[in-house]
């Protein structure tokens, strides 16, 4: 199962997907594309990095964060219905078969009338990041939950202590912060 | 490896439309990054021009705007540069460079020299 | 539009000396800055990209810091290669070059 992330028609939606470089500068090749992650690369390229930069992308998909220091979360502006789907995010971890995969189901809803802020999902992990959206409306202020730091071998030991609570599935499908190196 | 190269006539006549066009080896322009003209008058310092991306998209220098026009031939993976109205002022070794979506630049032509007179 | 002011234009030095160039831009641009080497009648090759991380193959002794209007390349001992003529630019998100230094033999 994917985890779901909500944004209204018109404002700006963020998926968020995180890992840490080795070194700083030291970048890990990162595609996200549209549709689930496939067995290599991704479908329907949206944006994708190499060891520098962003060399391909697509208009009104960003990068916001600072990528350089791991954080590849997709921004997407100006959102329609059809922004709806299921998306992937693939950490290229150089090696056979070393990729980490997170698949991010982003569920579009119509604008509401007359808009209030409300937050956009309840997560339970310490830190949270804290994202306004721009839009056609009001600013709205979302809180994502931000993971731990943790190492490729830990990720199953944990997702097992945690399997009763709500953190579990986000730690499985897309919040674990990927340690590289 | 990525190789670009200017190609175009050294000598333009005033008012008339200066062309220029940068073929690429060792990597497709439609695969990825953004493809910029930059030209240096002589003795002077460089100034961006303007790019075309991998999907066909173009930013241009806002001093350049009205007179620029940066277009692609992908089935001789071939970008060219169009300058309108030229004066002597335009006169300058033109590169062509391939860089990210943040326009900075990683491959250089190796330049073309350029000069407007009549 | 951002400017990129320069400094010094150009300046003399002898091999082995610590050599400091800066930059200031008109504006807060981020580290959304990169430096060129140029050798005349060629073309600019890249040294530094976002402030501070080198480009690849590029010596050591090459550094960039750096973030928001001041900017700085730092050769810490200077070779004879290294005589040349450096750019800074900003991208943010149109390109603009600062004015070049020029690194010449005391």
């Known amino acids: 199962s994917e985890v779901e992330y909500r944004a209204e028609v018109g404002q700006n939606a963020y998926l968020p997907c995180f890992y840490t470089p080795a070194a700083p500068g030291n970048l890990v090749p990162v595609c996200w594309g549209k549709g689930a992650c496939p067995v290599f690369e991704c479908g329907n390229v949206v944006l994708r990095t190499d060891e520098r930069d962003v060399n391909y992308w697509t208009s009104r998909y960003w990068l916001n964060g600072d990528f350089r220091k791991g954080d590849v979360s997709l921004t997407i502006e100006n959102v329609t219905l059809a922004d709806s789907g299921i998306y992937c995010c693939r950490i290229q971890i150089p090696g056979i078969m070393n990729d980490e995969k997170f698949n991010l189901k982003l569920v579009i809803k119509p604008a509401k009338v007359t808009p209030a802020p409300t937050r956009q999902r309840d997560f339970t992990a310490a830190f949270p990041r804290m994202l306004t959206t721009r839009g056609h409306g009001p600013a709205e202020t979302q809180t994502l939950g931000s993971l731990p730091d943790i190492n490729l071998t830990q990720i199953s030991t944990l997702a097992n202590e945690l399997r009763d609570s709500r953190l579990a599935n986000d730690l499985r499908d897309s919040g674990a912060t990927i340690r590289i190196g | 490896q990525v190789q670009l190269q200017e190609s175009g006539p050294g000598l333009v006549k005033p008012s008339q439309t200066l062309s220029l066009t940068c073929t690429v080896s060792?990597?497709?322009?439609?695969?990825?990054?953004?493809w910029n003209w930059i030209r240096q008058p002589p003795g002077k310092g460089l100034e961006w021009m303007g790019y075309?991306?991998?999907?066909?998209?173009?930013s241009y220098n806002p001093s350049l705007k009205s007179r620029i026009t940066i277009s692609v031939d992908t089935s001789k993976n071939q970008f060219s540069l169009k300058l309108s109205s030229v004066t002597a002022a335009d006169t300058a070794v033109y590169y062509c460079?391939?860089?990210?979506?943040?326009?900075?630049?990683?491959?250089w032509g190796q330049g073309t020299t350029v000069t407007v007179s009549s | 539009d951002i400017q990129m002011t320069q400094s010094p234009s150009s300046l003399s030095a002898s091999v082995g000396d610590r050599v400091t160039i800066t930059c200031k831009a008109s504006?807060?641009?981020?580290?959304?800055v990169a430096w060129y080497q140029q050798k005349p009648g060629k073309a600019p090759k890249s040294l530094i990209y976002?402030?501070?991380y080198r480009y690849s193959g590029v010596p050591s002794r090459f550094s960039g810091s750096g973030s928001g209007t001041d900017f700085t390349l730092t050769i810490s001992s200077l070779q004879p290669e290294d005589f040349a003529t450096y750019y800074c630019?900003?991208?943010?998100?149109?390109?603009?070059f600062g004015g070049g230094t020029k690194v010449e033999i005391k």
């Open positions: 075309i991306s991998h999907s066909g998209s173009t």
């Open positions: 460079a391939r860089g990210y979506r943040s326009p900075w630049f990683a491959y």
């Open positions: 504006q807060n641009v981020g580290a959304n």
């Open positions: 060792g990597y497709s322009i439609t695969s990825g990054f953004a």
């Open positions: 630019s900003q991208y943010n998100p149109y390109n603009t």
């Open positions: 976002s402030a501070s």
